[in-house]
């Protein structure tokens, strides 16, 4: 091919090209031919008749003005035709009459102001069609029911201003899982006019500047259709009222999404009328207040987010917002709640009391007060089956003895990113049976003792990152009890010194986050009573992390055993030579990293093992002695692995013998290497 | 086989209303796939299109500029036939009324009635 | 398409062919549909949608249309096709517009 199309597997890849006419040497069996971002002005028919195979058609961001009807002709199996972004303004009934089987049509952001006629009357197999970004004025299609199989119609951002039943009603056969309405300035729902649609499933207006009126003139012309889901984000409600959303009495209304509405009261009974109502997204608004009958009606909500829902605080301490004690009573169905982003002070003794269903509950940067976590704070879950919980960004500072004894069905606990500092007894965890996951990581001060985690024992995750930990070196261990732990994060916390039983007995431990330490003594040979190998006995451990940690050594046998290590990265330490066979038992080794070190020679008797079956290495940045006793079998190796190793050619360079400094290791020769061998051995005798 | 028949006084007065009706067999008034119209030709002269109307939620009809303020055209779905109403008649609209049967979905006639001679006389 | 103008008459020999224009400002983009008329009667359809026959047209009738111009062909003309021949198309909401007719005469 002359054109620098890429092909591959029948799909012919020629956006960006800056073409002006379409390439006609492309082979012949392509099925999809991608033509967007060129400066194609037409598309001759004729051109296409050697690709008619093609099943889809992308002429995108193009200057397309006209369309042959016979373009549809040559190309009788295509099914997806995108036109977005070109220049059309006039369809007539014979622009696509040829395209009987096209099951989506994207006409976004040309110039279509008005359909006239019926251009998509032959269009029985149509699934989506998209107008969106024209300047359409009206809804109207056509004169004629049609579109029988449309299930996606698209009209945001045109100058749509009234939805009126004569224009609606051409789709009394079809069943429109989605009608998109958004950005325009909606100001009139004529009488019938959802009726008219065979079935409507779901109605987006966003950004319709639709104000608490017109929203229930919406509702009630809405009545008594499929209509499932309606979308209402981004527009003027500024209060709802029991009235509000009545029409949709007759609905079972399953998902309302009335996010960035600047909606400051919510009234009493406002979704009354909901019972079926599953979903309901209230994010990114100005609620001063919930009270105990905000959410009354709301029987079978599953799903409620309230991120960032209330009013946000200013000087004055009357402004701060107000849950009201049982306002969720009414939502013993619901299952998630998320109330991030708030400026709620605290939780009080009822607040989510009749949340007896939920089961994830996210509370991050919700709270103005809630420095301390005391047993009172989430009394009013004890009856919620809560499995996941989330604290994080709430400057909690202390959690107090049974702070969670009421969640005895918790798996999930994020206490990160808070403030944290405090001695961990062990009570503040009381009642957590069933708790898989604990993550602490980014907190201000943790102090271990021996019973820290001791009425967890269920746990399998523990996240300690960057909390300055202390006692990590107390006996018993404050790990011991952890019998089920899989993932340990005891990264970034400058710890120079912990006992050979630090991790004893965690067996199923397959994830060790250690980086960002300070071990190097004791893996010194030099180290009083010798080396620490605290990593004796982690037979199932997949992933070891110990980078920065100023290691210069690795003793013998610290590694031993560790036969399902998949991975192990040890960058960015001091190492230089290592011992032959440390690496013996990691044959199943798929990643090493051990870039950023002090190595200058890669030995088979010590890289060997590893090397089996590595999917990647990275040894980017070490100063590799070029000698044939320090790098030849490397070379030898890379040359012929299929293991990754990015940016061999500028980050693998000699660093001596001074005339190969700065030389690139893979061009290293060895075949002299080899030759001398014989001599060596001759030279000893 | 879908068969039109017209009935009709053939002669109506000055500024009096002409009214014919087009009785349908063979097809329904109703029907979403064909429409119903009226057409005339004055002796001696073309076609002209009056009207036509069709169903879609509800009955919706179009009317040629010359006539939109003087004509309607209802359905009878009891009867499954149409009718054609025209006021204010002058022996300008002296001529033979079709009605007619437009096939979706680009409105071509695909069956005529036998045609109605009105005559507008004093 | 407010307007479609057609020549008053067309006259062929029998056995040849005959061709009816209808002209009208980028008829090419809309359907044309072709009736013909025999003193006294209704009108037939015999070319729909540019180009399409209906059942029971012979094979002579033949349409096409592009540009400004549509165009009727009588391929071996007969005698029997002597008649007043209309185009017409639609256009919402006007939706019937007539070319104002051509007598054919077979000589």
């Known amino acids: 091919s002359t054109t620098k199309c890429t092909v591959s597997h029948e799909v012919a890849d020629c956006s960006h090209l800056k073409l002006t006419q379409v390439p006609d040497d492309l082979p012949t069996n392509i099925t999809v031919l991608n033509l967007t971002h060129n400066q194609l002005r037409r598309l001759p028919a004729a051109n296409f008749t050697r690709y008619s195979q093609l099943t889809s058609l992308d002429v995108g961001f193009n200057t397309i003005s006209k369309l042959e009807p016979e373009l549809c002709q040559k190309l009788p199996m295509l099914k997806v035709l995108n036109l977005q972004h070109n220049e059309l303004s006039q369809l007539s009934d014979k622009t696509f009459a040829f395209c009987t089987n096209l099951t989506e049509l994207h006409l976004m952001s040309n110039s279509i102001q008005k359909i006239k006629n019926n251009p998509f009357v032959k269009q029985k197999n149509l699934i989506t069609l998209d107008l969106s970004h024209n300047g359409l004025s009206s809804t109207k299609l056509g004169t004629q029911v049609q579109l029988e199989n449309l299930q996606e119609l698209l009209l945001s951002n045109n100058k749509i201003q009234a939805l009126k039943s004569e224009e609606l009603d051409i789709f009394a056969n079809s069943s429109l899982k989605k009608l998109e309405l958004s950005s325009n300035q909606i100001k009139e729902f004529s009488p019938g006019c959802f009726q008219t649609i065979g079935k409507l499933f779901a109605l987006l207006l966003n950004n319709a500047q639709l104000n608490p009126h017109l929203t229930e003139k919406l509702c009630w012309e809405l009545s008594n259709t499929s209509i499932q889901n309606l979308s209402l984000a981004n527009n003027q409600l500024l209060a709802t009222s029991e009235s509000t959303f009545s029409g949709l009495k007759w609905t079972n209304l399953t998902q309302l999404d009335l996010s960035y509405n600047n909606l400051h009261d919510v009234g009493n009974g406002s979704f009354s009328y909901l019972p079926s109502l599953r979903y309901l997204s209230l994010e990114y608004n100005n609620i001063q207040r919930l009270s105990p009958r905000s959410f009354y009606g709301l029987s079978n909500l599953r799903y409620l987010s309230l991120k960032r829902a209330f009013t946000k605080q200013s000087v004055s301490l009357a402004s701060h917002p107000n849950i009201d004690d049982f306002s969720f009573q009414w939502l013993k169905y619901l299952e998630y709640l998320n109330m991030d982003d708030n400026n709620i002070p605290s939780t009080k003794s009822n607040t989510f009391t009749g949340l007896v269903s939920l089961k994830y509950l996210s509370l991050s940067k919700t709270f103005t007060s809630l420095q301390t976590l005391t047993n009172e704070t989430f009394v009013s879950l004890a009856h919620s089956p809560l499995l996941t919980l989330n604290l994080t960004k709430n400057h909690i500072s202390k959690i107090a003895n049974g702070t969670f004894s009421w969640l005895g069905q918790l798996r999930i606990l994020d206490l990160g990113l808070n403030e944290i500092e405090q001695k961990l007894s062990g009570q503040e965890w009381r009642g957590l049976r069933n708790i898989f996951e604990i993550y602490l990581s980014y907190n201000k001060y943790l102090q271990l003792s021996t019973s820290s985690f001791a009425l967890v024992p269920s746990l399998q995750r523990l996240m300690l990152r960057r909390v300055a930990l202390k006692n990590v070196d107390i006996s018993p261990s404050p790990f011991r009890p952890l019998r089920n732990l899989t993932i340990l994060d005891l990264s970034n916390n400058n710890i120079a010194n912990i006992n050979e039983d630090l991790l004893e007995g965690l067996e199923n431990l397959e994830i060790l986050d250690f980086q960002h330490n300070n071990l190097a003594r004791l893996w010194k040979r030099a180290n009083p009573g010798g080396p620490v190998n605290f990593l004796k006995g982690l037979s199932h451990l997949h992933i070891l992390n110990l980078e920065s940690n100023g290691l210069d050594e690795i003793p013998v046998g610290v590694f031993k055993n560790l036969f399902e290590l998949k991975s192990i990265n040890l960058g960015l330490n001091n190492l230089n030579k290592l011992e032959p066979f440390i690496f013996d038992d990691q044959t199943s080794l798929r990643s090493l990293n051990l870039q950023k070190n002090l190595i200058t020679s890669v030995e088979k008797d010590v890289f060997g093992p590893p090397f089996q079956n590595l999917n990647s290495l990275d040894m980017r940045f070490n100063p590799f002695d070029c000698t044939c006793e320090s790098i030849s079998w490397f070379v030898n190796w890379i040359n012929q692995t299929h293991t990754n190793i990015s940016e061999l050619s500028t980050h693998y360079l000699c660093n001596t013998p001074h005339h190969y400094y700065g030389f690139p290791l893979k061009l290293f020769d060895t075949s002299s290497c080899k030759d001398s061998a014989p001599f060596e051995l001759l030279f000893i005798i | 086989q879908v068969q039109l028949q017209q009935s009709g006084p053939g002669l109506v007065k000055p500024s009096q209303t002409l009214s014919l009706t087009c009785a349908i067999s063979g097809d329904s008034v109703s029907s979403n796939s064909a429409a119903w119209g009226w057409i005339r030709q004055s002796p001696g002269r073309g076609l002209e299109w009056l009207g036509i109307?069709?169903?879609?939620?509800?009955?919706?009809?179009n009317y040629a500029v010359s006539v939109k303020s003087r004509i309607t055209i209802n359905p009878d779905t009891s009867k499954n036939q149409f009718s054609l109403q025209l006021n204010s008649v002058t022996p300008e609209d002296t001529a033979v009324y079709y009605c007619a049967r437009y096939s979706y979905p680009f409105y071509s006639i695909d069956y005529w009635g036998q045609g109605t001679l009105v005559t507008v006389s004093s | 398409q407010s307007v479609l103008t057609q020549p008053p008459s067309v006259s062929v020999a029998p056995g040849q062919t005959a061709r009816i224009s209808c002209s009208g400002d980028?008829?090419?983009?809309?359907?044309v549909h072709w009736y013909q008329q025999k003193p006294g009667q209704a009108p037939v359809l015999v070319i729909y949608?540019?180009?399409e026959r209906p059942s029971g047209i012979p094979e002579r009738f033949s349409g096409s249309n592009s540009g400004n111009t549509a165009t009727l062909t009588i391929s071996g003309t007969q005698a029997e096709d002597e008649a007043d021949y209309y185009c017409?198309?639609?256009?919402?909401?006007?939706?019937?517009?007539f070319g104002g007719g051509t007598k054919l005469t077979v000589l």
């Open positions: 017409s198309s639609y256009d919402d909401p006007n939706f019937q517009v």
């Open positions: 109307i069709q169903k879609r939620s509800k009955w919706y009809n």
């Open positions: 980028n008829i090419g983009s809309y359907y």
């Open positions: 949608e540019d180009s």
